[in-house]
Interface confidence: low
């Protein structure tokens, strides 16, 4: 079953997904799609990386982690109820049927007037994120406002492979991680 992540309307949702490149700069193509992972590729692609960089993204979908080190976690800006559903992170490892597929369920809750839990505020203070919408209109700055609800029994045991990025290490307990090479 899918790991479930939550965000409130108007916040930025965070869907973690990691892998460890065999060598720095040797990136593996990754796609993010709306809907469960199909047999091949991603359906309804919202963002894609190639062997070098992000080569396709749509207006509210960003990789704000260090994707050059394998943090391909997806941030969805300013979510609405329509963003609820299953998202597919597919790490496209070369070879037949070698892809790693992760289905992540995003649940969007109506905005509350009450403050967010302390853990969420602490996370945002420690790791503010700027989302730039260059190429899609005027630049905007927002901070990540929600941490996913984590089912610890569903965590990848390979998360400790992510040594390069402090952010990745802090997030590894909530992310899908796969070692490449």
């Amino acid at each position: 079953s899918e790991v479930e992540y939550r965000a409130e309307v108007g916040q930025n949702a965070y869907l973690p997904c990691f892998y460890t490149p065999a060598a720095p700069g040797n990136l593996v193509p990754v796609c993010w799609g709306k809907g469960a992972c199909p047999v091949f590729e991603c359906g309804n692609v919202v963002l894609r990386t190639d062997e070098r960089d992000v080569n396709y993204w749509t207006s509210r979908y960003w990789l704000n982690g260090d994707f050059r080190k394998g943090d391909v976690s997806l941030t969805i800006e300013n979510v609405t109820l329509a963003d609820s559903g299953i998202y597919c992170c597919r790490i496209q490892i070369p070879g037949i049927m070698n892809d790693e597929k992760f289905n992540l369920k995003l649940v969007i809750k109506p905005a509350k007037v009450t403050p967010a839990p302390t853990r969420q505020r602490d996370f945002t203070a420690a790791f503010p994120r700027m989302l730039t919408t260059r190429g899609h209109g005027p630049a905007e700055t927002q901070t990540l406002g929600s941490l996913p609800d984590i089912n610890l029994t569903q965590i990848s045991t390979l998360a400790n492979e992510l040594r390069d990025s402090r952010l990745a290490n802090d997030l590894r307990d909530s992310g899908a991680t796969i070692r490449i090479g």
Epitope: D53, V54, R134, S165
Partner: antibody, heavy 117, light 108 residues
Framework: QVQLQESGPGLVKPSETLSLTCTVS????????WSWIRQPPGKGLEWIGY???????NYNPSLKSRVTISVDTSKNQFSLKLSSVTAADTAVYYC???????????WGQGTTVTVSS | EIVLTQSPGTLSLSPGERATLSCRAS???????LAWYQQKPGQAPRLLIY???SRATGIPDRFSGSGSGTDFTLTISRLEPEDFAVYYC?????????FGGGTKVEIK
């Protein structure tokens, strides 16, 4: 508009460590990558390395053994340390943003560092 | 490491003329990650073109970029006095990030 300002000593003795700081103003350092580039007198540009605001780094292999780049998000600064310098490290040192999508779109004005005894 | 070779080393032209600068890579560069910069004496480089052909913010449309694979071109359709400078290409999709040696566009 983000602006960058390099600072640090203009003269460093051979075998010592060169230390420079880049201060980011007009925006948050919490976005993508921050690079150091240098340009020896009368020569071309050489990329030294970059740091992601989370602290993740990537260095030019030709300098990797001597380079450390760090970030201080609370001060909106990132720094360069280059150890065991020689006269060949004399250059103008630039800091720049590196979004990963657009190339290096904002640069500091550069600071000249001379290595001499 | 991807080595970028720029030619010619120096281009002597008059204002109003067309300038064509070449950048050749030792191995294929994704066109999404090829940039051009302009540098004037005593100044920092300025981003002109990213993604091989997209103009950066505020860059006049007389500057255009093209090419793919290993061969890229920067064209200045009609040189203005302020365009005389050194131009560098850079690939930023493969580590280490590398720059070409530069082409100096000087007044004839």
């Amino acid at each position: 508009q983000v602006q960058l300002q390099e600072s640090g000593p203009g003269l460093v003795k051979p075998s010592e460590t060169l230390s420079l700081t880049c201060t980011v103003s007009g925006g948050s350092i919490s976005r993508y990558y921050w690079s150091w580039i240098r340009q020896p007198p009368g020569k071309g540009l050489e990329w030294i390395g970059y740091i992601h605001y989370t602290g993740s780094t990537n260095y030019n292999p030709s300098l990797k053994s001597r380079v450390t780049i760090s970030v201080d998000t609370s001060k909106n600064q990132f720094s360069l340390k280059l150890s065991s310098v020689t006269a060949a490290d004399t250059a103008v040192y630039y800091c720049a943003t590196d979004t990963g999508y657009y190339g290096m779109d904002v640069w500091g004005q550069g600071t000249t560092v001379t290595v001499s005894s | 490491e991807i080595v970028l070779t720029q030619s010619p080393g120096t281009l002597s032209l008059s204002p109003g003329e067309r300038a064509t600068l070449s950048c050749r890579a030792s191995q294929s560069v994704s066109s999404s990650y090829l940039a051009w910069y302009q540098q004037k004496p005593g100044q920092a480089p300025r981003l002109l073109i990213y993604g091989a052909s997209s103009r950066a913010t505020g860059i006049p449309d007389r500057f255009s970029g093209s090419g793919s694979g290993t061969d890229f071109t920067l064209t200045i359709s009609r040189l203005e006095p302020e365009d005389f400078a050194v131009y560098y290409c850079q690939q930023y999709g493969s580590s280490p990030l590398t720059f070409g040696g530069g082409t100096k566009v000087e007044i004839k």
